[in-house]
């Protein structure tokens, strides 16, 4: 006897099949407990963490994770070689750069080794799950007497693959000005007042040319330009988290 259940999932491109098996109907005393959902994120295309909520298991269970790519020469699942643990119980898997193929469907299987029939398979599009590192090396230069240019770098990811959110403000501003910059790691401010002190910071996301990631990176370290006069109201100038 077998049943195929389509689990609800967060991504319309993610499908999870829960396969239940048993030898005969009379042995079906209780339904098989569903497995936790696996969440994967690719960090800056350097490594990927696939994690699950191990505390959702009624008993401490070392679930195992196997994965493969839908279109590949080797169609067999391979087991995780680097498990992550929470309270000495498996709660995730770290997959290294060599094993990441962004543009092939990633098939991940979570299994209870004590009950091999208890397993769930999910299919993920990794290009939609990339979280970049915070932009680095923010540098400011004068293009003219009143025009300022901000540039930054993103490690390991092609700049054209990223969308950026720039925040800036002066010590006289009550709030940040925010701009979306697409695919070019630079931004120019046409008019600055040299009597003011400006602060800039940037974050990025892997969107929309190379993938459709919805998650933004952390903020860069802020950079400052201009007069080093004491701020009139420091509380207004505090960086929001």
């Amino acid at each position: 006897w077998s049943s195929k259940v389509l689990m609800s999932s967060a991504n319309e491109d993610i499908k999870a099949d829960l396969i239940l098996t048993s030898t005969a109907p009379e042995h079906l005393s209780a339904p098989t407990l569903p497995l936790p959902e696996v969440q994967c994120f690719v960090f800056n295309i350097e490594y990927m963490n696939c994690t699950w909520n191990s505390s959702s298991e009624p008993q401490a269970t070392n679930l195992t994770l196997h994965y493969r790519y839908k279109v590949s020469d080797n169609n067999t699942f391979q087991e995780c070689s680097h498990y992550l643990f929470s309270k000495e119980i498996t709660s995730g898997c770290q997959i290294q750069k060599e094993d990441i193929q962004l543009y092939q469907t990633f098939v991940v299987q979570l299994q209870d080794p004590q009950k091999p029939q208890r397993r769930a398979v999910q299919k993920l599009n990794l290009q939609n799950l990339v979280i970049p590192r915070a932009p680095e090396n923010l540098t400011l230069s004068n293009l003219s007497e009143s025009q300022l240019e901000l540039r930054w770098k993103s490690r390991h990811i092609k700049e054209r693959c990223l969308q950026y959110l720039v925040q800036y403000r002066s010590n006289r501003d009550r709030s940040w000005t925010e701009l979306i910059v697409n695919h070019e790691p630079r931004f120019s401010l046409p008019s600055v007042d040299e009597l003011k002190r400006y602060t800039f910071r940037v974050r990025s996301r892997y969107n929309p040319i190379c993938g459709s990631s919805q998650q933004w990176s952390k903020w860069s370290q802020p950079v400052h330009w201009g007069s080093h006069t004491v701020e009139e109201n420091p509380s207004l100038f505090a960086l929001e988290a």
């Epitope: 967060a10 991504n11 959110l165 009550r174 709030s175 940040w176 925010e178 933004w216 929001e240």
Partner: nanobody, 132 residues
């Protein structure tokens, strides 16, 4: 995985209406504030509206009295009803989420003005063009 998908954008004449929808999956509304952000043609970003746990939605001054934000928890949807549209409402509208913010006060003046950068997850956006 958290997933936000906007729909409902389009071309509309000044004075017209549109209703934007956002399909939400991968997390519970209880833990999140939902917002609508707007990228104008000059690429500036601003928060149009936020719906929070205290049922006291935030609206940018430029849309107060014209736009209404709502959510349907059963369907995991967030909506932005936009009436009396103006050319300056033109832009890309993003559905976005952030962790629930503490409720400071019913008096809006005591709350920090929300920023696009407060929202860590955005959808792909839907284009709204208001033009005759």
């Amino acid at each position: 995985q958290v997933q936000l998908q906007e729909s409902g954008g389009g071309l509309v004449q000044p004075g017209g209406s549109l209703r934007l929808s956002c399909t939400v999956s991968g997390f519970t509304f209880d833990e999140s504030d939902m917002g609508w952000l707007r990228q104008n043609p000059g690429n500036e970003c601003g928060v149009v509206s936020v719906i929070t746990s205290d049922d006291n939605p935030y609206y940018d001054d430029s849309v107060k009295g014209r736009f209404t934000i709502s959510e349907d928890n059963a369907k995991n949807m967030v909506y932005l009803q936009m009436n009396s549209l103006k050319p300056e409402d033109t832009g890309v509208y993003y559905c976005a989420t952030r962790s629930r913010q503490p409720v400071y006060s019913r008096d809006y003046e005591l709350r920090p003005r929300p920023l696009c950068g407060d929202f860590g997850v955005w959808g792909q956006g839907t284009q709204v063009t208001v033009s005759s």
